[in-house]
């Protein structure tokens, strides 16, 4: 099965600049293959832009300006980019790539989108950190004693822009687990949103990780926040004068400033 | 020029009582096309479920159907028993692909339709109210109640800010919510529920413990790293040496 | 934000294979594409490859096409990289590395040294 | 394939020096720039993206500029552990490539 993976969120760009957006292309030969890009301006039906075909063809929608969109495939990097020049108010759009997958006849073709790239254009240059910041709440002693069960919640404030998207993994896991959030608030001119998670009693042992993707993560990777194992059995131990930490002390910290 | 009008620009539903999403082509004939559906998802996600000829997304066989009017020139699609899930725009389009004639492989939108999920009517359920600190930071977590009508109050004398609740359905088919604020005295912030003509207060659902129940570490800042003045726990948690973790990263 | 582990040296003789590997940790493998450079002695660094280590999807330079093969073992979070038909040409420093976002990289592993000699 | 010219190829200056490292790219890139450093015998670092956002953890006397074809790495004031070769990398098509490098040597 054909597989759309659309690397970047966003892409925040300032006026008359150029946008590049990426795709690539897994499951499915590209060479084999057209790829589609669509628009989904704020508040209009999603457009089709431009297409590039297996022979390297490009199809544009009548009425779009040319020069504005340039396509390409690079069939060793089985990518599809879609170049946007001078970009203006009017581009500001989730861009979809898409393609037909390949079914045993014609007819029996379905189109598969990738997850879609926002493109913001600002008038502001951001210098300061926009990245989201962390805070974790552990589940409250009582919600553990009383439920069985524990809910970890992950607050990221103080981001730019407002695109982020957030999941939950158990380590060593690939399965995303069914969470619940809130929705993103504006405040000043940032953003913060909240997630939480809870599990059952049996899965409190095991680490969680609260997985953000946002465009200005530190170093432009997935920030990966964990959730330490909560252990429900306790012991009672002599403090120790002087400030040492052993291994199996590491800065006793586990964030369980959550009362009841 | 074609277009594809949906019947409702917004449709509740109920958990588990059948939907039914219509979408009308104007200028042009129906058959002429192929129908398909999408459903776009918090997070932009468009994902394929139904395509004419019996073609269906993965995972959408079970719980949706689609079908064409070819008498009243609509497109329908039918989500049997709505879950949370369910939730999103979804949006009908065309194409020609396969067909002859003038051949389109791009495909034509109509505007989205907005589901919204609902619980079925149900008994009300008094909510479980509880609440997590981090700092300055409290979130009172309200948990399975129902009808929806809620009011929850962070009780404190500092308040820095505080934000709207997120309200959700739960997997259970009831709502929970989660409300969040900052105060200077975090400690003594508690967090009381107004819902169903009761208050229900998180101070209800304390355990009494000992002191050495759980860990009380210095307050730390929200996004700054551990204090680094050393404190004299009264116990420890075994976290299996997870507090290298980068909490506030 | 995790860490990138590569195996030890290798001394190959010219016209055999070899298969490096990347173990990773701290960070969510499937969602991320790991690649590959090359940096002879005293030179600059070549993109070879990179590969999603969930999907399995490989990019490659095109001059390294027929040359490398890269795989991945979601299982124990693992990239690989199987070098072919080895010359002298291709004793280098080999880098795994994690990709950003864009296309630069953001994680490096701490390299493996290949040398091929007769 | 766009090729990347960097100068100098090598650099001597002394501690709290301030030195600037140029890359030419042969066409137009528009910030889609990558800067590293690399220290003898060690992997190579990310310090610089998108032309000009530091890297987690790069102080800030790092500063990275540029547009089109022309691009630059400042380091303000000197340190001793800035010493090294450090490399600019453009990441605008495929396949991506690296400049030749600029050695960074202690005067």
């Known amino acids: 099965a054909g597989h759309l993976e659309q690397p970047q969120i966003s892409s925040t760009k300032t006026l008359s600049k150029t946008a590049r957006l990426e795709c690539v292309v897994s499951g499915i030969t590209i060479s084999a293959t057209s790829v589609y890009w669509y628009r989904e301006r704020p508040g209009e039906v999603i457009q089709f832009l431009v297409s590039i075909s297996y022979d390297g063809t490009v199809r544009k929608e009548s009425g779009i300006p040319s020069g504005k969109f340039e396509v390409d495939r690079i069939p060793e990097t089985s990518t599809s980019t879609l170049t946007i020049h001078n970009v203006e108010k009017q581009d500001i759009a989730t861009y979809y790539c898409a393609l037909w997958e390949a079914q045993q006849e014609l007819g029996k073709k379905i189109k598969v989108f990738g997850p879609g790239t926002k493109l913001i254009i600002t008038d502001k240059q951001l210098d300061a950190d926009v990245s989201p910041k962390p805070t974790i709440f552990l589940p409250s002693i009582a919600e553990t004693k009383l439920q069985k069960a524990g809910t970890y919640l992950c607050l990221l404030e103080k981001f730019f822009p407002d695109v982020i998207k957030i999941h939950w993994q158990e380590k060593k896991s690939n399965t995303i687990l069914g969470s619940q959030e809130g929705n993103t608030m504006k405040t000043n001119d940032t953003y913060m949103k909240f997630s939480w998670l809870t599990v059952p009693e049996k899965s409190l042992d095991k680490e969680h990780r609260c997985i953000v993707r946002h465009e200005n993560n530190k170093n432009g990777v997935d920030q990966e926040i964990i959730f330490p194992p909560i252990k429900t059995d306790v012991i009672t131990m002599d403090p120790k004068d002087n400030c040492s930490k052993d291994a199996n002390d590491t800065l006793l910290l586990q964030l369980t400033n959550t009362s009841a | 020029a074609i277009e594809l009008v949906p019947e409702h620009q917004t449709v509740p539903v109920s958990i588990g009582v059948p939907a039914t999403l219509r979408c009308s082509m104007k200028g042009e004939a129906i058959g002429n096309y192929y129908i398909n559906w999408y459903r776009k998802t918090q997070g932009n996600t468009m994902t394929f479920i139904y395509r004419e000829k019996d073609i269906y997304g993965p995972g959408f066989k079970d719980n949706f159907q689609g079908d064409i009017d070819i008498a009243k020139n609509l497109a329908v699609l039918k989500i049997l028993a709505p879950s949370e899930r369910d939730e999103g725009s979804y949006y009908c389009a065309c194409d020609t692909l396969g067909m002859g004639g003038e051949y389109t492989d791009k495909l034509i939108f109509g505007k989205g339709t907005r589901v919204t999920v609902e619980p079925r009517s149900q008994p009300h359920t008094k909510p479980s109210v509880f609440v997590m600190k981090n700092g300055t930071n409290v979130a009172c977590l309200v948990k399975e109640f129902y009808p929806k009508d809620i009011r929850i109050n962070l009780v404190s004398s500092k308040k820095i800010t505080e934000f709207d609740p997120a309200i959700v359905i739960s997997p259970s088919g009831k709502y929970n919510a989660v409300k969040l604020g900052k105060y200077e005295d975090s400690n003594s912030v508690t967090c009381s529920v107004q819902h169903d003509n009761k208050t229900v207060h998180s101070t209800d659902f304390e355990v009494k413990t000992d002191s050495t129940d759980h860990v009380k570490p210095k307050e730390t800042e929200n996004t700054k790293q551990p204090s680094k003045s050393c404190h004299k726990p009264k116990a420890i948690v075994h976290t299996e040496k997870v507090n290298m973790m980068s909490l506030t990263v | 934000q995790g860490q990138m582990q590569q195996s030890g040296a290798e001394l190959v003789k010219p016209g055999a294979s070899v298969k490096l590997s990347c173990k990773t940790s701290g960070f969510t493998f499937s969602s991320n594409y790991i690649s590959w450079l090359k940096q002879k002695p005293g030179q600059s660094l070549e993109w070879i490859a990179w590969?999603?280590?969930?999907?399995?999807?490989?990019g490659y330079n095109q001059k390294f096409t027929g040359k490398a093969q890269l795989t991945v073992d979601t299982s124990s979070t693992t990239a690989y990289m199987q070098f072919s038909s080895l010359t002298t040409e291709d004793s280098a420093i080999y880098y795994c590395?994690?990709?950003?976002?864009?296309?630069?990289?953001?994680?490096w592993g701490q390299g493996t040294l290949v040398t091929v000699s007769a | 394939d766009i090729q990347m010219t960097q100068s100098p190829a090598s650099l001597s200056a002394s501690v709290g020096e301030t030195v600037t490292i140029t890359c030419r790219a042969s066409?137009?890139?528009?910030?889609?720039l990558a800067w590293y450093q690399q220290k003898q015998g060690k992997s190579p670092q990310l310090l610089v993206y998108?032309?000009?956002t530091l890297a987690d953890g790069v102080p800030s006397r790092f500063s990275g500029s540029g547009s089109g074809t022309q691009y630059s790495l400042k380091i303000n004031s000197l340190q001793p552990e800035d010493f090294g070769n450090y490399y600019c990398q453009h990441f605008w098509s495929y396949p991506l490539t690296f400049g030749a490098g600029t050695k960074l040597e202690l005067k």
């Open positions: 590969i999603h280590g969930g999907t399995g999807g490989i």
């Open positions: 998108n032309a000009k």
């Open positions: 590395a994690r990709r950003g976002y864009g296309a630069w990289f953001a994680y």
């Open positions: 066409e137009n890139i528009h910030n889609y």
